[in-house]
C-alpha cells in the first residue's frame, strides 16, 4: 500500500494510542539510491526502532503520561554510512486512553462558612488531578456531593460546582444553617473522570469537614430614646457589627425624611445626632448597611427601630376659646350639663396626658357660688346645688383649670339657662303616604320633606328637632338633614336604592330634642310619623367588585400565564361576559366567563408599567348593559436590557498629532429598574487588541473614562469597542462603539477640506 504504510523519506506525523501492544508496523521508508540503509535518532526511549531496510515500528506499549509526543529523526545512509538524505522529522503523537484515575489532592478538607452567607459564593475548593489528557473526556473531571451529614428534612445546605470543585451554600443553607443547632457538617465529595458521563469512569472521594460560624450581622433590639434630651449630642443609641473588621457602614433612610437625626461611625456605632420630638415623630425605622472595601453590600441591610419616649412637654389645650353648654330651668341636681374635653399632645394613656378638671371660678355667684361641679377626670359638668332660674341669671361663666402632672391651663365655659323642655315635637302629618322611586335615583337626592314643631323656647336645645329613622331602613340608605332655623327635615338618599333587596320599605321617623324632657313628660305618637318607599326595578349594569383591579407579575412570565382576574355581579342575576378594552399592546386576553386574565405575548416593563387596560362586564341577555373597570398590571423588572451609551457620541475627536495622552468621559445607561443604588456598570475594552492603544477606567456606576495609552495615533477615525456589564442577575453585557477621530485642527476644530462633509467631528478633546 504505497502512501499509507510505505513511501519515500519525508517529514511525517503518526498518532498511536497509548497502552496498546504493537500489532503492526508504523511505516516502511523506501530508499532512493545511493541510499541503502536508514538510521533513527531522537526521543526513541528504546521503544521506536527502524530496521536497516527502513521499517519503522515500536516494540512495546506507549505511555502518554510519560511522553505525549516523541520527536524522532530518520536519515538515509549510503553504503559507507554517510547521510545522503535527511534527517527528516518524524513526530509520533501518543493518543490518550483513560488509564489514570482522578485523585483528590487531600484526603480530608476543612473549611468554615458563616451562617446566612450569600448562596453560591464559594467558601472552599476541593481539587483533584488526573494524569490523563484534559483536552479529552479522560481528563475531564466532574465533582459531586455524595452525602451531607447531617441531612435535615432531606434538604441540601451545600452545593458544589461540578467543574471547579467550588463549595458554596444553597439558598436553603443560607437561610437555615444555624451553629446553635448544628455547628458542623461533613460532606463526602466524589470526583469522576469522563466528565462524569460514562459508566466506565474512574472516581475518587474525599471528606470535607465544615464548621458553621455565627453571623453577628443581626438587627439590634428596638431602641427607646427619650425626647428633648438635653445631653450633649451625638449620643450612641445602639450598634451593628459586621462579622469582620474593616466593613464600611452607612445608614439608609427609607422614609426620605427632611431631617434624619441619626448617624453611624466606622465601628458600626449608631448615634442620634439631635434631640427628638415625639410629637413630631414618635418612631423611626431605618436601615444599617455594611459594605466591603469596594463599596459592595456585604449582606442584607438591618432594620433599626427607634421609639421616641414621651416626656411631659405639652400643656393641656382647651377645645375652643369658649365652650357653650345649655341647662334647663328646674333641671334636677346631678343632671349632666355637658362634657369639657381638653386635649394634651403628649402620649395617650400615660400620666403625661392624663388630665384633671377643677372649677376655679363661677360668675356671677348668684344665687350662690358652687352651683356647678365638674368630674375631676371625666370633665363632665353637673348641676350641684339647686335648679336655676332663667329670669334671675340667664348665663353663667365658669373658669376651669385643666392640669396634667406638670402643667395647668385655664378653659372657659359659658352655660346658658334655657326654658324647661316640657313640650314635645309634634309632626304636622303622621303619615306621609307612599313614594315611588326608581332604584337608580341619584345619591344626595331629597325625596321628601317632613316637618314637626316644638313650642319650647326657640333656638335652644329644648326646641331644636332631630329626626331619626327608627324603622324600615336597616341598610342606612336614607338620612334626614334638619334646617336649624325652621326645624324642617329633608329626607335624602345616602346609599343606592335596591329593588332586588328592598322593593318596599315602611319607614318610621322619630322627632326628638337634644335636651332631655322634664320629668313626667314623654315622647308620644305625635312625635312619630311614617311613609312607605316603593322602589321600582331598573335594569342595572353589572357591578365590579373593585373600581381598579391590580396585579403584579415579573415581566418575563411565560406566554399563557394567568396574570390576574376580575369579578363583577349583575344585580338582576344575569350571567356576565368579560372583555378587554384598550389592550393597545396586545399583551392580554380575558376568559369571557371567569374573568381570568392571561398573557398572550411577551411582556416588557420598559415599554411601560403599570400596563393599564379596561375590563368590560356585559350582561348576557336582557339589555346587554355593561360597566367598565380598570385593570392595572404592574410589571416587575428582570434584567433584560443590556447597557448602552446614554447619548450619541458621534463627533468625538482629538487634535493630531497628540501632544500628550488624552481622555474623554462617556455615560452608560440601560432601561432596567435600578433601585436603592442606581446602576452599577463595569467597563472594559471590547477586545484585547485595543489594550495597547486605549484604556477604560470606571468613574462611578454610570460613567467611565476612555484614555489614550500613548500619542502615536494615525490621522484617521478609530472605532473603540467598549464592553459594558450591568452586573445584574443574570448579568447582561452590551458592546458599544465610540468613534474617535484623530484629525488636523484649526483653532481647536477638525479641519476638513471642502467637499468632505460627512461625519464632521464636533467635540474636541
Amino acid at each position: 500500500q504505497e502512501g499509507k504504510f510505505s513511501g519515500p523519506l519525508k517529514p511525517m506525523t503518526f498518532s498511536i494510542y497509548e497502552g496498546q501492544e504493537p500489532s503492526q508496523i508504523i511505516f516502511q521508508f523506501k530508499a532512493n539510491p545511493p541510499a541503502v540503509t536508514f538510521e533513527l535518532t531522537g526521543e526513541t526511549d528504546n521503544i521506536f526502532v527502524i530496521e536497516r531496510e527502513g521499517l519503522l515500528y515500536y516494540n512495546r506499549a506507549l505511555d502518554r503520561e510519560t511522553r505525549s509526543t516523541h520527536n524522532l529523526q530518520v536519515a538515509a545512509l549510503d553504503a559507507n554510512g554517510i547521510i545522503v538524505e535527511g534527517p527528516v522529522p518524524i513526530t509520533i503523537k501518543v493518543k490518550d486512553i483513560n488509564d489514570n484515575r482522578p485523585t483528590f489532592l487531600q484526603s480530608k478538607y476543612e473549611g468554615s462558612v458563616r451562617q446566612n452567607s450569600r448562596p453560591g459564593k464559594p467558601f472552599l475548593y476541593v481539587n483533584a488531578t488526573d494524569l490523563d489528557d484534559p483536552a479529552t473526556p479522560n481528563g475531564q473531571l466532574y465533582y459531586q456531593i455524595v452525602i451531607q451529614l447531617p441531612m435535615i428534612n432531606n434538604v441540601m445546605y451545600f452545593q458544589i460546582n461540578n467543574k471547579t470543585g467550588a463549595i458554596s451554600l444553597t439558598r436553603e443553607g443560607s437561610q437555615e444553617l444555624n451553629p446553635a443547632k448544628n455547628p458542623s457538617y461533613n460532606l463526602v465529595i466524589s470526583v469522576k473522570d469522563m466528565g462524569g458521563q460514562s459508566e466506565n469512569s474512574f472516581s475518587d472521594t474525599t471528606s470535607v469537614d465544615i464548621i458553621v460560624t455565627e453571623n453577628i450581622w443581626k438587627a439590634p433590639k428596638p431602641v427607646e430614646m427619650v425626647e428633648n434630651s438635653t445631653d450633649p449630642h451625638p449620643i450612641k443609641i445602639t450598634q451593628v457589627r459586621w462579622n469582620d473588621p474593616g466593613a464600611q457602614y452607612s445608614l439608609v433612610d427609607k422614609e426620605k425624611l427632611p431631617r434624619f437625626p441619626f448617624s453611624i461611625d466606622q465601628e458600626g456605632d449608631i448615634y442620634v445626632t439631635q434631640p427628638l420630638d415625639r410629637e413630631e415623630k414618635d418612631a423611626y425605622v431605618f436601615y444599617a448597611v455594611a459594605k466591603d472595601e469596594y463599596g459592595k453590600p456585604l449582606s442584607y441591610p438591618l432594620e433599626i427601630h427607634v421609639k421616641v419616649k414621651d416626656i411631659n412637654d405639652n400643656p393641656p389645650t382647651c377645645p375652643s376659646p369658649v365652650t357653650v353648654f345649655e341647662v334647663q330651668e328646674n333641671e334636677r341636681l346631678g343632671n349632666s350639663i355637658g362634657t369639657l374635653t381638653a386635649h394634651d399632645r403628649d402620649e395617650e394613656n400615660t400620666a403625661n396626658s392624663f388630665l384633671n378638671y377643677r372649677i376655679v371660678e363661677q360668675t356671677p355667684k348668684l344665687p350662690m357660688d358652687g352651683l356647678f361641679l365638674i368630674q375631676t377626670y371625666a370633665g363632665m359638668l353637673q348641676l350641684a346645688k339647686q335648679s336655676l332660674k332663667k329670669q334671675d341669671t340667664p348665663q353663667y361663666n365658669l373658669t376651669i383649670e385643666v392640669s396634667d402632672k406638670d402643667f395647668k391651663t385655664l378653659c372657659f365655659v359659658q352655660i346658658n339657662v334655657i326654658d324647661i323642655n316640657d313640650q314635645i315635637p309634634i309632626f304636622e302629618k303622621s303619615d306621609y303616604g307612599n313614594l315611588t322611586l326608581a332604584e337608580d335615583t341619584n345619591i344626595g337626592s331629597t325625596i321628601l320633606t317632613i316637618q314637626a314643631t316644638d313650642a319650647d323656647e326657640p333656638f335652644t336645645g329644648s326646641s331644636k328637632i332631630l329626626y331619626h329613622i327608627i324603622k324600615g331602613d336597616s341598610e342606612g340608605r336614607l338620612g334626614v338633614d334638619t334646617d336649624p332655623h325652621t326645624n324642617t327635615g329633608y329626607v335624602i338618599i345616602k346609599k343606592p336604592l335596591d329593588f332586588e333587596t328592598a322593593a318596599v320599605s315602611n319607614i318610621v321617623f322619630k322627632a326628638e330634642n337634644p335636651e332631655p324632657l322634664v320629668f313626667g313628660v314623654k315622647y308620644n305618637a305625635s312625635s312619630f310619623a311614617k311613609f312607605t318607599l316603593i322602589v321600582t326595578d331598573v335594569n342595572e349594569a353589572p357591578q365590579f367588585s373593585q373600581h381598579v383591579f391590580q396585579a403584579k407579575v415579573s415581566e418575563d412570565v411565560a406566554i399563557g400565564t394567568k396574570v390576574g382576574n376580575v369579578t363583577a355581579k349583575d344585580p338582576e342575576g344575569l350571567d356576565i361576559s368579560y372583555s378587554l378594552r384598550g389592550d393597545t399592546r396586545g399583551w392580554l386576553k380575558i376568559d369571557h366567563v371567569t374573568g381570568e386574565i392571561f398573557s398572550v405575548a411577551p411582556l416588557d416593563r420598559e415599554a411601560g408599567s403599570p400596563y393599564r387596560v379596561q375590563v368590560v362586564a356585559t350582561e348576557v341577555g336582557g339589555s346587554s348593559l355593561s360597566s367598565v373597570s380598570e385593570f392595572h398590571l404592574i410589571l416587575m423588572d428582570v434584567n433584560d436590557n443590556p447597557p448602552r451609551l446614554a447619548k450619541d457620541y458621534t463627533g468625538l475627536f482629538f487634535c493630531h498629532p497628540l501632544s500628550a495622552p488624552g481622555s474623554l468621559i462617556f455615560e452608560a445607561t440601560d432601561d432596567d429598574q435600578h433601585l436603592f443604588r442606581g446602576p452599577h456598570f463595569t467597563f472594559s475594552l471590547g477586545s484585547g487588541s485595543l489594550q495597547n492603544d486605549w484604556e477604560v477606567s470606571k468613574i462611578n456606576g454610570t460613567h467611565a473614562r476612555l484614555s489614550t495609552r500613548h500619542t502615536e495615533f494615525e490621522e484617521r477615525e478609530y472605532v473603540v469597542l467598549i464592553r459594558i456589564n450591568d452586573g445584574g442577575r443574570p448579568p447582561l453585557e452590551g458592546i458599544v462603539s465610540l468613534p474617535v477621530t484623530f484629525c488636523s485642527c484649526v483653532e481647536g476644530s477638525c479641519f476638513r477640506p471642502a467637499g468632505h462633509q460627512t461625519g464632521i467631528p464636533t467635540v474636541g478633546m
Epitope: R118, K121, P122, F123, L124, Y125, N127, T164, A166, E214, I216, R241, W242, N243, D244, P245, G246, A247, D292, E293, Y294, G295, K296, L298, H680, T682, F683, K698, G727
Partner: antibody
Framework: QVQLQQSGAELVRPGASVTLSCKAS????????MHWVKQTPVHGLEWIGG????????VYNLRFKDKAILTADKSSSTAYMELRSLTSEDSAVYYC??????????????WGQGTLVSVSA | DIGMSQSPSSLAVSVGEKVTMSCKSS????????????LAWYQQKPGQSPKLLIY???TRESGVPDRFTGSGSGTDFTLTINSVKAEDLAVYYC?????????FGGGTKLEIK
C-alpha cells in the same frame, strides 16, 4: 486548583510605564478581589492595593495611589497593574495575591509566582 | 496605618529544636465582636512566593503541619515551630488583616545550623 500566573520579568527605563498581568484560573474570577504586593530587600513586603473585578472597585495604599493603576479583564480572567513614572525605587518583585474566602478581612491564601521589575537606564 | 514589627530579624537553630518568633502591632488586632485576632503568618522559602501558614492568629491553614503554632492576642503574637525541620528554612512574615492598608512585619529569617 486555584492558580495565579504572572507575566515575565521586565527591564524598563526610568520615567517609563509598565503593565504587569496576573491570569487567574481554577475559580470564578469575579468572586474574589485581586491584590498586589511589592517586595524589596529594603522594605520587605508592602501591600499596594486591591481590585474587585465584579464592581471594578479599587482600594489603594496611599503610598502607591499615584504609582499603580489596577484593572482587570473579566473575559480573560486577568488582573493588571500598571506602574507609572518608574524610578529605581520601583525595582522589586511584584506579586498578585488572592484572599482564601470572600471577606473584608481575609489573608492572602493564593499568590502568583511574582514578576521582577528592574528599572535601569 | 497599623505598624508591624518582628523580632528577631534572624535566628539560627538546629534541626529538631523548638523556635519562637515574635510579632507586635501598634494597635490591637482583636475584634471584640467575635473575639478573633486578625493576624496572619506567612512562610517564604528562598526563590518562592509567600505561603499562608496561620490566620486569625492561631488557626492553621489547611495542609500546614501541626508543628507550626500561632498564639497571642491584642498586640503581641508569637509563631512557634515545635521541632524544626530542614525544609523550614525560610523568612516568616506576620501581616495584620484588621484594617487598610494591609501591613506586614519586616520578617524573621530562620536559618538552620
Amino acid at each position: 486548583q486555584v492558580q495565579l500566573q504572572q507575566s515575565g520579568a521586565e527591564l524598563v527605563r526610568p520615567g517609563a510605564s509598565v503593565t504587569l498581568s496576573c491570569k487567574a484560573s481554577g475559580y470564578t474570577f469575579t468572586d474574589y478581589d485581586m491584590h498586589w504586593v511589592k517586595q524589596t530587600p529594603v522594605h520587605g513586603l508592602e501591600w499596594i492595593g486591591g481590585f474587585d473585578p465584579e464592581s471594578a472597585g479599587t482600594v489603594y495604599n496611599l503610598r502607591f495611589k499615584d504609582k499603580a493603576i489596577l484593572t482587570a479583564d473579566k473575559s480573560s480572567s486577568t488582573a493588571y497593574m500598571e506602574l507609572r513614572s518608574l524610578t529605581s525605587e520601583d525595582s522589586a518583585v511584584y506579586y498578585c495575591a488572592r484572599k482564601g474566602y470572600y471577606s473584608v478581612s481575609s489573608p492572602f491564601t493564593y499568590w502568583g509566582q511574582g514578576t521582577l521589575v528592574s528599572v535601569s537606564a | 496605618d497599623i505598624g508591624m514589627s518582628q523580632s528577631p530579624s534572624s535566628l539560627a537553630v538546629s534541626v529538631g529544636e523548638k523556635v519562637t518568633m515574635s510579632c507586635k502591632s501598634s494597635q490591637s488586632l482583636l475584634y471584640s465582636s467575635n473575639q478573633k485576632n486578625y493576624l496572619a503568618w506567612y512562610q517564604q522559602k528562598p526563590g518562592q512566593s509567600p505561603k499562608l501558614l496561620i490566620y486569625w492568629a492561631s488557626t492553621r491553614e489547611s495542609g500546614v503541619p501541626d508543628r507550626f503554632t500561632g498564639s497571642g492576642s491584642g498586640t503581641d503574637f508569637t509563631l512557634t515551630i515545635n521541632s524544626v525541620k530542614a525544609e523550614d528554612l525560610a523568612v516568616y512574615y506576620c501581616q495584620q488583616c484588621y484594617s487598610y492598608p494591609r501591613t506586614f512585619g519586616g520578617g524573621t529569617k530562620l536559618e538552620i545550623k
